[in-house]
């Protein structure tokens, strides 16, 4: 389906508006450093020339790709070299090396100061004197910070955003009205920002095929009801999808996104029977809706998968015949009839059935060496059951803060070499596990909390690949995608591993402290947790939990005293000489 | 254990159509290849057309442009429209099935089978 010219096709198909937004949020990912200002004007010169396209598709440079409109642009931002060093010989390139170029010098952990929430007036009147600056500034910060955002996801963002700003603006009480809007709105970003995260790094780093199996054993949990062929086409279509949008082609992404919404809605009766509400919503909110859509139920008596994939004559034949096909039917099959497995544990069963065929089908006697293949699936399915059910007492029993220090603790005599900040940061996201899915029932468990896992242990991959540290981390990372998490909860200590040297600075602590919000204190305390556990690798549970309860006691004391900052320096040192002694 | 079972078989003039059906039960059978075979009178049963899961069809030469296999998963049925029809092909019309990715055109290589529908072509 060729078009004369790219740009004008995508301007009409997704509308002015959608246009400037997603050409908006391509650049803030691509150019993370620019100011909002010269992002704007940016795309306000594509905007004006995807215009002439489209009054003229045979108008110079209209027939020109997207890759070179838009990279010739960026590369015309006067500061590059200074700004971004290297990534301005991206520059000297020619398509397509150039966008690869750009795409490679995206930064997971940009380091740009936390955005600073105003005052409730200050947004409100900001919103009311120039909607469509604060709106696109929204799409700006985002991107920027998160440059693998689903593109047309923070476009639903951007429009909740923009409606809780007018409906709470007018309110009577505005900050009780906007203020839980917008925690929520950064909380499910950040989310989302994540679970996007490993679907591009899925496709990067392990191919295709990895993020089409990922697809068909969701999908196929999702919609129980559509036969393999249906599955197979919207697998086919997302899998497109989303190789676009973490390529930096978004335009390309959200047009099929919502292509793909349209073929959902208009074959309900063929996918699934919880589609009908979706499908009644404007674009943005129905493509949101499709995706977050919940199971459907299982079609009733599903007959033994044993018959067709262990006791058929057939099972190397198919397999020799059409490999990945047949394993994606396996896949379906076991996936359709287990909603209560994750999808991670459902991969590696079909990953454990692939390599018995591997080894039997050569063998003398192939089925007699595949006989007893799902007797071989018991103990993978055991492992992330008992870990669930483990960290869920644990969780239980200790609340959320003590239950992340324990992980805190796990993790960093796991892989020590680590930076404090990224062991704080995943640390206490592993830890946000217990909120999330312990409280649900069992059948659901497992599925959000080791789906849950892989997404945040993706976020300490991706960060250690900018700077690599640990061998540990390095493996457990690149050699296998959906053994990640049980690679992470097999290591043990490192003993090879040289314990820090003691620095007081790092354990002295200001009246600052006592200003800071909860989870500030929180993050302050876990971070010196970490110190503490890199100086002494070797301390029990008690012992730190000693250190950590007068820790609070002593931040406590200083808090109430009337001269915090004395306090601090008096009660600092002893604190700390107590700690060193109780750790010795 | 798949149950298969054809029916629309007849007498027909040359040149005249018909549409014969086949229904399975005791499993789905979407992923499964589907076909039909045929033996005249005297002769060895051979390959009319097959279907896979894609729905992707394959025929024998002699019936090519003539006949159209379908399936409907909903309904766990196979079909075969049957047009041009032409006295060669009186035969009592089989509908096989196996577990097979590829559709094999070989009547050895399936699994389940009806008890076949009589179709006669004549004037």
């Known amino acids: 389906d060729t078009h004369k010219s790219e740009v004008a096709h995508r301007f009409k198909d997704l509308g002015e508006e959608h246009f400037k937004g997603l050409v908006l949020v391509a650049f803030s990912q691509y150019l993370q450093q620019c100011p909002f200002e010269e992002h704007v004007k940016l795309v306000n010169e594509v905007t004006e020339f995807a215009k002439t396209c489209v009054a003229d598709e045979s108008a110079e440079n209209c027939d020109k790709s997207l890759h070179t409109l838009f990279g010739d642009k960026l590369c015309t931002v006067a500061t590059l070299r200074e700004t971004y060093g290297e990534m301005a010989d991206c520059c000297a390139k020619q398509e397509p090396e150039r966008n690869e170029c750009f795409l490679q010098h995206k930064d997971d952990n940009p380091n740009l100061p936390p955005l600073v929430r105003p005052e409730v007036d200050v947004m409100c009147t900001a919103f009311h004197d120039n909607e469509a600056t604060f709106l696109k500034k929204y799409l700006y910060e985002v991107a920027r910070r998160h440059p693998y955002f689903y593109a047309p996801e923070l476009l639903f963002f951007a429009a909740r955003y923009k409606a809780a700003f007018a409906e709470c603006c007018q309110a009577a009480d505005k900050a009780a009205c906007l203020l839980p809007k917008l925690d929520e709105l950064r909380d499910e970003g950040k989310a989302s920002s994540a679970k996007q995260r490993l679907k591009c790094a899925s496709l990067q780093k392990f191919g295709d095929r990895a993020f089409k199996a990922w697809a068909v054993a969701r999908l196929s949990q999702k919609f129980p009801k559509a036969e393999f062929a249906e599955v197979s086409k919207l697998v086919t279509d997302l899998t497109k999808v989303h190789t676009e949008c973490c390529h930096g082609d978004l335009l390309e992404c959200a047009d099929d996104r919502a292509d793909l919404a349209k073929y959902m809605c208009e074959n309900q009766d063929s996918i699934s029977s919880k589609l009908k509400e979706c499908c009644d919503k404007p674009l943005l909110e129905k493509s949101h809706c499709l995706a977050e859509v919940e199971n459907d139920e299982m079609p009733a008596d599903l007959p033994s998968l044993a018959a067709d994939y262990v006791e058929s004559k057939d099972v190397c034949k198919n397999y020799a015949e059409a490999k990945d096909v047949f394993l994606g039917m396996f896949l379906y099959e076991y996936a359709r009839r287990h909603p209560d497995y994750s999808v991670m544990l459902l991969l590696r069963l079909a990953k454990a059935y692939e390599a018995t065929l591997e080894k039997c089908c050569a063998a003398a006697d192939p089925h007699e060496c595949y006989a007893k293949v799902f007797d071989e699936f018991q103990p993978l399915v055991e492992e992330p059951q008992n870990l669930v059910k483990q960290n869920c007492e644990l969780f239980e029993q200790l609340g959320e803060y003590k239950f992340q220090n324990a992980l805190l603790v796990r993790y960093t005599k796991k892989v020590p070499q680590v930076s404090t900040p990224t062991l704080v940061e995943v640390s206490r996201n592993l830890g946000k596990v217990g909120a999330k899915c312990c409280k649900l029932p069992e059948a659901k468990r497992m599925p959000c909390a080791e789906d849950y896992l892989s997404v945040v242990l993706n976020r300490l991959c991706v960060l250690h690949e900018k700077t690599p540290v640990s061998e540990k981390v390095t493996k457990c990372c690149t050699e296998s995608l959906v053994n990640r998490r049980p690679c992470f909860s097999a290591l043990e200590l490192d003993e090879a591993y040289v314990p820090k040297a003691f620095n007081a600075e790092t354990f002295t602590f200001h009246a600052d402290m006592c200003t800071l919000s909860e989870k500030e204190k929180q993050v302050k305390k876990q971070t010196a947790l970490v110190e503490l556990v890199k100086h002494k690798p070797k301390a029990t549970k008690e012992q730190l939990k000693g250190v950590m309860d007068n820790f609070a006691a002593f931040v406590e004391k200083c808090c109430k005293a009337d001269d915090k900052e004395a306090c601090f320096a008096e009660e600092g040192p002893k604190f700390v000489a107590a700690s060193q002694a109780a750790l010795a | 254990e798949v149950q298969l079972v054809e029916s629309g078989g007849g007498l027909v003039k040359p040149g005249g159509s018909l549409r014969l059906s086949c229904a399975a039960s005791g499993r789905p059978v979407s992923n499964y290849a589907a076909a039909w075979f045929r033996q005249a009178p005297g002769k060895e049963r051979e390959f009319v057309s097959a279907i896979n899961w894609q729905k992707t069809a394959t025929y024998a030469d002699s019936v090519k442009g003539r006949f159209t296999i379908s399936r409907d998963n909903a309904k766990n049925s196979l079909y075969l429209q049957m047009n041009s029809l032409r006295a060669e092909d009186t035969a009592v019309y089989y509908c096989?099935?196996?577990?097979?990715?590829?559709?094999?055109?070989?009547?050895?290589?399936?699994?389940?089978w009806g008890q076949g529908t009589l179709v006669t072509v004549s004037s």
């Open positions: 096989a099935a196996v577990f097979r990715v590829v559709a094999p055109k070989t009547q050895y290589d399936y699994d389940y």
